[in-house]
């Protein structure tokens, strides 16, 4: 609450995180022609990524694009990409939705579809939608230990959310444990109202908020956490502003001494860790 | 403006953003001793990497060390690196600007030069000038989409950059369509008073700064995004403090049972969004 | 120092870090069986990875698991997860400590020891400790430049810690050369009170504060860093809250056409560079 | 699926020419050829993108093998001259996205160089 006689400061923060869990995927793979159902398990170092602190990613869905070649081929027949001549295809014009730079040639993309060649990483990536239900829907159990270290320098304070006291093997909830800081991700989702299930196939940003409100007079000291959760992308946005959360990344190889890459589309959400407050002081 | 009856309170902000565009990039490659021109595609997985919410990078320029091997070998003949004889090489001396650790011989290097042989990822890294006009130079024509989403906890309210009434085709002007959140990367420079094309060859850092002033009272309600843009790195900086924006990664492998690696330098543009302002209610 | 009758506005900041410095590393190398002294040179490349610009980290010691495949094997003999019969281990159930899911089978791991069989990455992590000392100790001698670029945009000021009078090859000492933004790894930890070589063990968090504390107006105008350095994670904090600062990442690669990676175990020092203050003018 | 049919496989001597032949039941981006050796993995000799741009050659037969196709008739020759007994294998047609990618495969042809 507002001491209006208190000098305001603003925290200053720093945050680690640390995922825990593992999942099993099961999906469609295809070899030499021939498509059987694989299964494969995921541990944090498949799904998450080094990121700073106050933001962590964990992959919850993901399209791949195998043994990815630099060299000509016929661009995907996504609506509006299909040609009957050469006409249609202008050289050296990059689409902002294609994936390559046009040679000027109309090609066959398969028995019944023309579309234009293109110079790009072949076969371009498929415009197919994320798997549903998401690969890596058991994400939803993971759970993540935020570490918050904080700092009031002109009050000369510091202090941490994770007190000695503290039992390591606690679970975050609101109402039972509102000071635990390991959090079930799906307990954050169903807490911001939201369905982990339904935004692990496109994925999302989530918002965990902490708050500290901090009073530093010694006779009436009190400074502990505040743990809040609203998810930060807009799942009502329009197609073209590119709704979830979503990014590409390769894996490069040679094989045979040719230069490739597998193309990883990988889903998730980003977590973001948004610290705030003030500490207060006679 | 100042309305000092209100209560002021700072944002809070998340950022997500999308790099959209292709490069061809054209350069000289030796392959068995023959030197030809070669074409290369790079997408998104290509230039950029997977990297926090109010940061991204973009490549526009690199230098290539292929093939290294953990072993012995002169190094590189940078200026006042030579060496005639024996005693200017100190076994286990470590020279900072040296990218190994002196085995103590002075050694030949090619058939004019000698300098002292190091354990290191060898051959050493080429000390040589970034690519003039940059590699992918053409990233000029990338777009980014920001999506801003900002909250101002004590007043409870939140909002976004990006409404649903607007256009995913537009492209951002400060005159035409300052609310688009669409930027071509070229016109955020021209924006800034800078040269995309010079900028691209050694990097640099380009701020995005996007101002909330929010007037949340309900009778004069306002709260839209500003957007400008400057550039954070100095260009007229002393080489001895690292001018530009560049950093080494580097693709490990193996070949006849032998870890090599090929190190890249990687010159580009960091893309900062720096999101501050506040939101004022009576 | 507080002047009231100033307009007090919080800085804008962006951070650029560069690391410099060769590690040699020396450890026991298994092949074919044979165990043996092996030696090798880490430069930035290898212990650094491109993170935003106000953190970086620093690997100072690591545990590998290399050649591992997903397939079914013993899980790691930890304290508590050894089994005598098939009764002991839950088909489908993921220990939160283990690396896989149980298969509902009571196998042989050694000689004398049986443990739950497990889907996944196999051979699974030994908990073995992180070699101690650090395999990366020498990072202590390692330099980074921090470049930092502030603004105080409502009064339009601009300004960085970097000035053109600065010599590069200067190292900053608290009373010798307080401005100097190179600063040697190991003289930060002294700084802070901190011994490195046993942070770099299991890895630690470091803070780099950097404090501008501006008088913006033309007859009294100050506006220059003071930086200052303290631990950011609980060197005191409980096992389960995972002490130190580790993470995990996989190089992935094929082999005779199955599907392999290295998992690294990596430790560190994740710096966080902490930019804070205010410009004043009236 | 694309159906392929091979033809114009045979007995030659070292040094000899043979021409291969290759009609597929649809047209398609690419069409190339593979070949596999007793005891030996399948490898890539010859591939060509639509109106025969571009070509790829495996190493060991640059400057000896010639690939075109004709696209009207969704057919591929493979042109070989200074036969070698190391060519010696069966050697398959082959349709894909792209001279590096192939998804189909006809049933084979045999190529035996005699020395």
């Known amino acids: 609450s507002d001491k209006l006689y208190q000098r305001k400061e603003p925290v200053i923060s720093s945050v680690h995180t640390k995922v825990k869990g593992i999942a099993e995927v099961t999906e469609n793979v295809t070899e030499g022609g021939v498509t059987k159902l694989g299964h494969s398990i995921f541990d944090t170092a498949d799904y998450t990524f080094p990121l700073q602190g106050n933001s962590f990613f964990v992959m919850t869905n993901y399209v791949k694009s195998e043994g990815q070649v630099q060299t000509l081929c016929p661009e995907y027949p996504r609506r509006g990409a299909q040609c009957s001549s050469d006409r249609r295809c202008k050289k050296g014009w990059m689409d902002p939705q294609s994936k390559g730079i046009q040679t000027g040639r109309c090609v066959p993309y398969d028995k019944t579809r023309k579309t234009c060649e293109v110079s790009a990483w072949c076969p371009t990536e498929e415009e197919k939608e994320a798997p549903r239900p998401a690969l890596l829907r058991s994400a939803e159990n993971f759970t993540v230990l935020i570490k918050n270290n904080i700092h009031f320098p002109g009050h000369n304070y510091t202090t941490r959310n994770i007190l000695p006291t503290m039992n390591g093997s606690c679970t975050f909830h609101k109402t039972w444990d509102p000071q635990c800081s390991i959090f079930r991700l799906g307990d954050i989702f169903q807490e911001a109202g939201e369905n982990f299930t339904e935004v692990a196939v496109q994925g999302g940003i989530m918002g965990i908020e902490i708050y500290w409100d901090c009073n530093l007079d010694s006779w009436s000291h009190h400074c502990r956490p505040r743990y809040s959760f609203r998810r930060l992308d807009d799942k009502n946005m329009d197609e073209s502003f590119v709704p979830g959360y979503n990014f590409r990344y390769a894996k490069y190889y040679k094989e045979n001494n040719v230069e490739k890459r597998t193309l990883i589309k990988a889903f998730g959400i980003r977590f973001d860790i948004l610290v705030f407050g003030t500490g207060g002081k006679f | 403006s100042d309305k000092l009856y209100q209560r002021k309170e700072p944002v809070i902000s998340s950022v997500h953003t999308k790099v959209k565009g292709i490069a061809e990039v054209t350069e000289n490659v030796t392959e068995g001793g023959v030197t030809k021109l070669g074409h290369s595609i790079f997408d998104t997985a290509d230039y950029t990497f997977p990297l926090q919410g109010n940061s991204f990078f973009v490549m526009t320029n690199y230098v290539k060390s292929e093939g290294q091997v953990q072993t012995l070998c002169p190094e590189y003949p940078r200026r006042g690196a030579q060496c005639s004889s024996d005693r200017r090489c100190k076994k286990g001396w470590m020279d900072p600007q040296s990218k190994g650790i002196q085995t103590g011989r002075c050694v030949p290097y090619d058939k004019t030069r000698k300098t002292c042989e190091v354990s290191a990822w060898c051959p050493t890294e080429e000390e040589k000038e970034a690519p003039r006009p940059a590699l992918l130079r053409s990233a000029e024509n990338f777009t980014v989409l920001i999506k801003n989403n900002i909250h101002f906890p004590g007043h409870n309210y939140t909002t976004r950059n990006i409404l649903p009434t607007m256009n995913g085709s537009c492209t951002f002007h400060k005159t035409w369509d300052p609310q688009c959140s669409i930027f071509r990367l070229g016109d955020i420079f021209q924006e800034a008073g800078e040269n995309f094309t010079e900028v691209a060859v050694q990097g640099g850092i380009m701020g995005i700064e996007i101002y909330w002033d929010c007037n949340l009272d309900s009778w004069s309600h306002h709260c839209r995004p500003r957007y400008s843009f400057r550039r954070l790195d100095d260009k007229n900086m002393d080489e001895s403090f690292v001018p530009g924006y560049n950093f080494r990664y580097a693709k490990y492998y193996k070949e006849n049972n032998v870890e090599k690696r090929t190190l890249i330098k990687a010159f580009g543009i960091r893309f900062d969004i720096l999101v501050f302002g506040t939101g004022g209610k009576f | 120092s507080d002047k009231l009758y100033q307009r007090k506005e919080p800085v804008i900041s962006s951070v650029h870090t560069k690391v410099k410095g060769i590690a040699e590393v020396t450890e026991n190398v298994t092949e074919g069986g044979v165990t043996k002294l092996g030696h090798s040179i880490f430069d930035t490349a290898d212990y650094t990875f491109p993170l935003q610009g106000n953190s970086f980290f620093v690997m100072t010691n690591y545990v590998k698991s290399e050649g591992q495949v997903q397939t079914l094997c013993p899980e790691y003999p930890r304290r508590g997860a050894q089994c005598s019969s098939d009764r002991r281990c839950k088909k489908g159930w993921m220990d939160p400590q283990s690396k896989g899911i149980q298969t509902g089978r009571c196998v042989p791991y050694d000689k004398t020891r049986k443990t739950c069989e497990v889907s996944a990455w196999c051979p699974t992590e030994e908990e073995k400790e992180a070699p101690r000392p650090a395999l990366l100790r020498s990072a202590e001698n390692f330099t980074v430049l921090i470049k930092n670029n502030i603004h105080f945009p409502g009064h339009n000021y601009t300004t960085r810690n970097i000035l053109p009078t600065m010599n590069g090859s200067c190292t900053f000492h608290k009373t010798w050369d307080p401005q100097c933004s190179i600063f040697r790894l190991g003289d930060i930890f002294q700084e802070a009170g901190e011994n490195f070589t046993e942070v770099a063990v299991q890895g630690g968090i470091m803070g780099i504060e950097i404090y501008w504390d501006c008088n913006l107006d033309s007859w009294s105008h100050h506006c220059r860093p003071r930086y200052s350095f303290r631990r950011l994670d609980d060197k005191n904090m409980d096992e389960s809250f995972v002490p130190g600062y580790n993470f995990r990442y996989a190089k992935y690669y094929k082999e005779n056409n199955v599907e392999k990676r290295t998992l690294i175990k990596a430790f560190g020092i994740r710096f966080d560079i902490l930019v804070f203050g205010t410009g004043g003018k009236f | 699926e694309v159906q392929l049919v091979e033809s114009g496989g045979g007995l030659v001597q070292a040094g000899g020419s043979l021409r291969l032949s290759c009609a597929a039941s649809e047209r398609t981006y690419s069409m190339g050829w593979f070949r596999q050796a007793p005891g030996k993995e399948r490898e890539f000799v010859a591939g060509?993108?639509?109106?025969?741009?571009?070509?790829r050659y495996a190493d060991s037969v640059k400057g000896r093998f010639t690939i075109s196709r004709d696209n009207a008739k969704n057919t591929v020759s493979l042109q070989m001259s200074g036969l070698k007994p190391e060519d010696t294998a069966i050697y398959y047609c082959a349709t894909g996205t792209s001279v590096y990618h192939y998804q189909y495969w006809g049933q084979g042809t045999q190529v035996t160089v005699s020395s």
């Open positions: 060509s993108g639509w109106d025969g741009i571009p070509t």
